[in-house]
């Protein structure tokens, strides 16, 4: 028995204690935030601790419940939206998860005026997506893959579309990799501002190879779950973008919107789809070879009944250096012309920020410019436009919101939340009233989360909405790492880290190092916001530095960082976490004979073939959900970076960035591989080629798999596996149990 | 002034095709929806078929479904229905009308076909 | 299908008289998707009441339509000479678009 003297001699700081894993699984140190739900730009809903359904008024400061718990509780609702006209309410009940963003539920239409569920012509059930219009109450809502209108809750409903298919064609909804890699919603609908028009995307999946893998569930057969899915080359939907009067629906029916010209010659996508006025909608395409985007602006031309989409408001945005955009091509923001709007894409000096187009993108006024990125424009009033971007301070994984004065002239700007809470707050996002006349300031770090509102005009603080006193209070006896956010410079790129250290650090002793990394195109892990997760554990508990490094394809450090990794995705991503590890060592605290990487997803293909890089830099590592070649990856996102894996193309970099290639080189290493069987993102295919590969070649390792599971790995199989990784470790490291 | 002018009816035998052309003029014809509605003689009206303004949805009756195609050249502004596998019960004057399920505020002014041996 | 189903089958009156043409839907329809035309003999139908129950282009305001749900109205204020013919009542809220069979207007 070792006696170990104690760390602490006063009875304050005796009472401290590590991080267990127990609390990172059960959830014990997780923060709220506070959105308003804004009805108005004065008013906003907001879902109370008891679950009654709160309307604030911000200037009388008066709240009333529009639905109780009870009505709620009445069909085990556990989601809301309240009509425009403010008559209706629909509730959400019978939740069922599909995909990232897609899910099926029930639906109940509450007529507030009576107090009553509407009776007839009731919703059909499950409903794949339902909304309102934007005024008024009409609802569009997608039943088995069709689009159907009703002009109120209790009418009977105008069925859109008929040829909707399961896994052929989609109305209103995305197919899979539409939904994962393009729109990010499980929507493909969109009203027009006053609720006139509805415009909506129909994919046509009939020509896409179909993934299948089985989900065992608890029969005596397994199922086959059966996805249309464009792998990197393989055939992809054929979008078609179709606007239809919602007034009378049944006359001229569903109008479809021309594709440009310099689109429709290739393979092309749909990206988004933006109103700007009843009559005038903008829709953004982009070649199948993501470096040409170009945005549409159509109009209605009432005497002809149709959508008119000319040249002349065709908009070409084109990358030289890699793909268009960012993660995803940037949407306009349109001023009070209805016609003009700000967009962010990159200057001439390779930074991503944001312009003001008038007529053409030549002649775009720069309206942001620096070494550093405009990330988000929030909103744009008459004479104020508000975005969030990292310049303050030079620190590219913070986030602070600007206000730019564009009524005037020169416009000034103003930082919002640099200075408000400055230690405690420097990663902010925000949510603005109708006319931005009050807004809500979210902080996500890098202290305890906040969410506050604030005026407007005079962006006074008006209340705390959120301030996680109880986390406060419970992390009061906790011994919370350290964690520091610093760059190095090498070869003239500059790799952001942010290092994770235990409570009692001491810079004279040797720790394991374990490296947690992501690394996909534009991605960014070393951000300034809080968080209690396993890492956390692994330094407060088990004594491990944990670092994240930013490497060459990460974020909003410029064009030159991002696009790096074009066309060559694998290489440079490795080895910059590669040269951030030597540069650990350098530091003298690191034991280097104890070194591991993990993974998740891109993360898990990056750890890999770090372990694989021959380096003998590490001892272990752990990849969960990996990809392992490009070829059994989506389409869209795939060929953005590495465009097509074709002999002509860029076949050669498809086959030796695969982890298989490798598998040899894993011999020296200890190797956890772990997957979900049912992940309908990155193929269980993708670790079962590793695995056979690894046996092939007879290299030992160590592999979990999680029956039934997707790529978030979610539910007890999180317990499992993060217990599971942590023995991992632990053994790795010698450290005990 | 809108007008729509249909033509290609006449008598065919059981199994046999036709095909009814609809020639529209005095208005933006690629923008709007057309249908097909039928009336058999003596009887009331059937809508046969419809086809948005770019072509790119087409629907039929239950009846047709099949047998019938409904198409549209908007470049030389004519409506088109292919009629294959005829049957007596098809006999009737159709109309072309400008509409897509309702509405239809202009019609043509009848070919007659008639399916006899 | 939505079964419409016209009443009565012939309405004989004089001019100068209401008419009152009545349509049932065998399910609900709103006056949204329903539309009224007037057929008269070796003619093409022609529009009355647009959906919506707006009157067509050219329509004399003696036509009207009325009615929600599953029962319809159209009135013809006062009949004029040429207002005897073949009424349809059609609906276009589900696929196939259908049309009662029909309410003749005969002179009394």
């Known amino acids: 028995i070792v006696l170990r003297p104690s760390r602490v001699h006063n009875s304050e700081e005796n009472t401290m204690r590590a991080l267990t894993l127990k609390d990172i699984l059960n959830g014990t140190f997780s923060y709220k935030t506070f959105f308003p739900n804004w009805i108005s730009g004065q008013e906003y809903l907001h879902q109370s601790a008891d679950n009654n359904i709160v309307l604030y008024n911000i200037e009388t400061g008066q709240s009333y419940t529009i639905l109780s718990n009870r009505t709620m509780k009445s069909v085990n609702a556990s989601n809301y939206g309240l009509s425009p006209d403010r008559q209706f309410v629909y509730l959400e009940s019978d939740y069922s998860k599909l995909w990232r963003y897609s899910y099926t539920a029930t639906y109940y239409i509450y007529d507030l005026s009576n107090g009553e569920f509407v009776r007839g012509n009731e919703l059909p059930r499950p409903i794949q997506y339902l909304c309102w219009s934007p005024v008024g109450s009409k609802l569009a809502y997608v039943y088995q893959n069709n689009i159907y209108l009703k002009q109120r809750p209790g009418d009977p409903p105008f069925q859109i579309t008929f040829n909707g298919r399961e896994n052929k064609i989609f109305n209103g909804i995305p197919d899979w990799v539409y939904e994962e890699e393009m729109l990010a919603t499980k929507y493909a609908l969109w009203w027009s501002p006053n609720g006139k028009f509805l415009a909506y995307a129909e994919f046509n999946d009939t020509d896409i190879p179909v993934i299948a893998y089985s989900y065992y569930g608890d029969e005596q057969y397994p199922r086959t779950i059966n996805i249309p899915y464009p792998k990197a080359g393989a055939k992809n939907p054929v979008v078609r973008i179709f606007i239809i009067d919602t007034t009378y629906p049944a006359y001229v029916g569903p109008q479809e919107v021309p594709v440009p010209a310099m689109i429709a010659s290739s393979d092309y996508y749909f990206s988004w789809l933006t109103w700007v006025t009843d009559e005038r909608v903008c829709l953004q395409w982009l070649k199948r070879v993501q470096n040409v985007s170009v945005l549409s602006i159509c109009d209605f031309r009432e005497d002809w009944q149709t959508w008119d989409c000319p040249k002349t408001q065709e908009h070409i945005e084109e990358s030289r250096t890699g793909w268009a955009g960012g993660f995803f091509v940037s949407t306009p923001v349109f001023s009070y012309d209805a016609i003009s709007y700000y967009k962010i894409f990159s200057d001439k000096d390779g930074y991503k920020h944001i312009h003001y187009i008038k007529d053409t993108v030549e002649n775009a006024i720069q309206i942001t410019s620096g070494k550093w990125e405009a990330i988000n424009i929030f909103r744009v009033t008459q004479d104020s436009l508000f975005y969030s971007s990292n310049e303050f301070e030079e620190y590219p994984g913070r986030r602070n919101i600007y206000r730019i004065s564009i009524g005037s002239y020169p416009p000034s700007k103003k930082c919002v939340t640099c200075h408000l809470r400055k230690e405690r707050c420097q990663y902010y996002t925000a949510s603005f009233s109708d006319y931005a006349k009050y807004y809500a300031l979210v902080c996500y770090g890098p202290g305890i989360p906040i969410s506050t509102l604030h005026d407007g005009r005079t962006d006074q603080e008006i209340k705390i909405l959120e301030e996680n006193k109880e986390l406060e209070n419970a992390l009061k006896n906790i011994q919370l790492p350290k964690e520091e956010i610093k760059k190095l410079e090498v070869d003239e790129i500059t790799l952001w880290y942010k290092m994770i250290l235990p409570p009692q650090f001491d810079r004279s002793k040797k720790y394991p190092l374990l490296i947690q990394v992501y690394g996909g195109p534009c991605s960014q892990s070393v951000r300034s916001v809080f968080a209690v997760n396993w890492i956390s554990y692994l330094a407060s508990k088990e004594g491990m530095v944990i670092a994240l490094v930013d490497g060459r394809g990460t974020a909003f450090q410029g064009d030159k960082l991002l696009y790096a990794v074009y066309r060559k995705l694998g290489v440079y991503e490795v080895e910059d976490q590669i040269t951030a590890v030597r540069k650990f060592i350098e530091m003298g605290f690191i034991d280097e004979k104890r070194i591991a990487i993990w993974g998740w997803s891109y993360g898990g293909y990056v750890s890999s073939l770090a372990l694989a890089s021959g380096t003998g830099l590490f001892k272990c590592g752990i990849a969960v959900a990996p990809v392992s070649s490009w070829e059994y990856y989506a389409s869209v996102y795939t060929e953005r970076f590495m465009g097509l894996p074709t002999k002509d193309d860029n076949l050669e970099h498809y086959k030796n960035s695969t982890v298989m290639a490798r598998a040899e080189y894993f011999r020296n290493v200890d190797y956890l591989l772990i997957h979900g069987t049912a992940d309908d993102n990155v193929h269980f295919q993708n670790s079962a080629q590793i695995a056979k590969a690894l046996v092939n070649a007879q290299v030992d390792f160590q592999a979990m798999w999680y029956s039934d599971q997707n790529h978030g790995l979610s539910g007890l199989s999180t317990n499992h596996l993060y217990t599971h990784m942590t023995h991992f470790l632990k053994q790795c490291f010698s450290l005990s149990d | 002034e809108v007008q729509l002018l249909e033509s290609g009816g006449g008598l065919v035998q059981p199994g046999g095709s036709l095909r009814l052309s609809c020639a529209a003029s005095g208005f933006t014809f690629s923008s709007y929806a057309m249908s097909w509605v039928r009336q058999a003689p003596g009887k009331g009206l059937e809508w046969v078929s419809g086809?948005?303004?770019?072509?790119?949805?087409?629907y039929y009756a239950d009846s047709v479904k099949g047998d019938f195609t409904i198409s549209r050249d908007n470049s030389g502004n004519t409506l088109y229905l292919q009629m294959n596998s005829l049957r007596a019960e098809d006999t009737a004057v159709y109309y072309c009308?400008?509409?897509?399920?309702?509405?239809?505020?202009?019609w043509g002014q009848g070919t007659l076909v008639t399916v006899s041996s | 299908e939505i079964v419409l189903t016209q009443s009565p089958g012939t309405l004989s009156l004089s001019p100068g008289e209401r008419a009152t043409l009545s349509c049932r839907a065998s399910?609900?329809?709103?006056?949204?998707?329903l539309a009224w035309y007037q057929q008269k003999p070796g003619q093409a139908p022609r529009l009355l009441i647009n959906?919506?129950?707006r009157r067509a282009t050219g329509i004399p305001d003696r036509f009207s339509g009325s009615g929600s749900g599953t029962d319809f109205t159209l009135t013809i204020s006062r009949l004029e000479p040429e207002d005897f013919a073949v009424y349809y009542c059609q609906q276009g809220i589900m696929l196939p678009p259908t049309f009662g069979q029909g309410t003749k207007v005969e002179i009394k």
């Open positions: 009308a400008k509409g897509w399920f309702g509405g239809f505020n202009y």
């Open positions: 959906v919506g129950s």
């Open positions: 399910q609900s329809v709103t006056s949204s998707y």
């Open positions: 086809i948005i303004g770019s072509g790119g949805i087409t």
